[in-house]
């Protein structure tokens, strides 16, 4: 019995289509594959950013795979051919590994790249990113921002920069159609007549950096002799009610009485008849049902009642 062997895939490579971190891994079938024509050959692909402790592992019948990477670091990948046991009348046969790497040749020293990059998706409508120039760069240094997400044909450059002293220090993005719940890739590169500038790459999902508007229309309603219902409305805009968490801060007679986090637009407060003043503010945040993370809104305008017995009437401001 001759031992069954299979070759590794050919021409295993990582291809950068210019999407700022979304890369293609592709390969060709091994030589002599048609010996196993009646058999479905699979490929085991392992890949990671250099420096990462864990490999991502994929088993596929395809000749390509796509994923996002951090281009601030290098990428390494390896692949081998798998012949399932059904093809070999016994145990699974594996080829040797084919390996490849990819990295963007860095220009400039790390200190020249932008500092303190911060991106906020205001009210799930308007994306704004801001940064500080690199350390020790001259005023002739200018930074340019490019972005891509799946659905765009190619990476786009910012067309509305925020400037300070003639330097780009931020970008106001246009309307970004169908851009949430997918990786959003940004590259900020730079140019200077004096010295090369290091590029920076960032990846996030827009729904995770949403800062909503604060809630509106705060009201009080007396529910019983010792209960007051606080109510408010969801902020204006595209975010549905089911996506909000709220934090309430309630002050009774200048003393913080309660800080609470709730999922609905109401909160019932136990009070005493001695209460002379009641104030509350609310802020909103996108909840775990709609995102993995988020940014608290500013606090709402304060809604207060003072000078009358709270038990006498419904309070509306």
């Amino acid at each position: 019995d001759t031992e069954i062997k299979v070759n590794p895939p050919q021409d295993f490579e990582i291809v950068d289509p210019g999407y700022l971190g979304y890369l293609y891994l592709q390969w060709q079938p091994p030589l002599s594959l048609d010996h196993f024509k009646e058999c479905t050959v699979e490929y085991e692909l392992k890949y990671r950013n250099i420096g990462s402790e864990t490999w991502k592992t994929i088993i596929t019948k395809n000749l390509h795979y796509k994923d996002g990477f951090d281009l601030n670091k290098g990428i390494e990948a390896k692949i081998h051919t798998l012949l399932p046991w059904q093809c070999t009348n016994g145990s699974e046969v594996q080829s040797s590994w084919a390996e490849t790497t990819y990295w963007i040749s860095p220009q400039g020293i790390p200190e020249t790249k932008v500092q303190d990059m911060d991106c906020v998706y205001y009210n799930w409508q308007y994306l704004l990113c801001s940064w500080k120039p690199g350390i020790g760069v001259l005023l002739d240094t200018n930074y340019n921002l490019f972005y891509w997400y799946e659905g765009l044909d190619h990476a786009l450059q910012c067309v509305d920069y925020i400037k300070a002293d003639g330097q780009n220090i931020g970008c106001r993005f246009p309307y970004l159609e169908a851009s949430d719940y997918k990786d959003f890739y940004i590259c900020v590169n730079g140019s200077s007549e004096n010295k090369p500038i290091r590029s920076s790459y960032f990846t996030f999902q827009l729904q995770n950096i949403v800062k909503p508007l604060p809630p509106v229309y705060l009201t009080f309603t007396r529910e019983s002799s010792c209960e007051i219902k606080l109510k408010w409305s969801i902020p204006l805009g595209p975010i549905p009610a089911r996506c909000f968490d709220y934090e309430i801060e309630i002050r009774e007679d200048d003393t913080t009485l309660v800080t609470a986090t709730v999922e609905n637009e109401t909160y019932t407060l136990k009070t005493t008849n001695e209460t002379r003043q009641l104030c509350f503010v609310v802020r909103s945040k996108v909840n775990i049902y709609c995102s993995d993370d988020g940014i608290w809104s500013e606090w709402s305008d304060k809604q207060c009642w003072e000078g009358e017995d709270l038990s006498k009437k419904t309070l509306l401001r």
Partner: antibody, heavy 118, light 107 residues
Amino acid sequence: EVKLVESGGGLVKPGGSLKLSCAASGFTFSSYGMSWVRQTPEKRLEWVATISGGGSYTYYPDSVKGRFTISRDNARNNLYLQMNSLRSEDTALYYCARRDLRSAMDYWGQGTSVTVSS
Amino acid sequence: DIVMTQSQKFMSTSVGDRVSVTCKASQNVDINVAWYQQKPGQSPKALIYSASYRYSGVPDRFTGSGSGTDFTLTISNVQSEDLAEFFCQQYNSYPLTFGGGTKLEIK
């Protein structure tokens, strides 16, 4: 329909340079390796160069290594062959061919003629 | 380099006949051989890959066989449009190499 159209051939003196182009259409260009193959006046076929789909791998026979460079522009679906230090034995009809998944060549262009003569 | 030898430069046959074109590799190339047909004034067309598998659209009159060092392209029921030159090619290792070609003449 897969289509490969070569251009850039012509008459050049020994020692001169020429750049051939191949415009590809009808398939996902970046997923396929591409080759240049030439046919001599005696009708012999000679492999000249191969490049992988992403351009990371290039292969040449010793006869052209160091003189010819294969490259590709996947954004424009174009394949190129830069030929330097041309010799009379480089005279041939140059074909651009798509490499299939087995490394054979499943589609060929119509060819562009290169004549190296003083 | 692997040398691919097509010992018959010319073959003469008649319409309806069966003809075999042979190709010998100077070393083992497993099944990594392709066959091409080049009609007069045209570019080569792929017929067979992996020694015995027809490309789609190729008539089943064309059959490839062999492995290792000896390969055969058989054309059964030869047609007048089969007037062409046939080339074998190995892609088992670089440099890729072609046979010298076999011209099929129709009587």
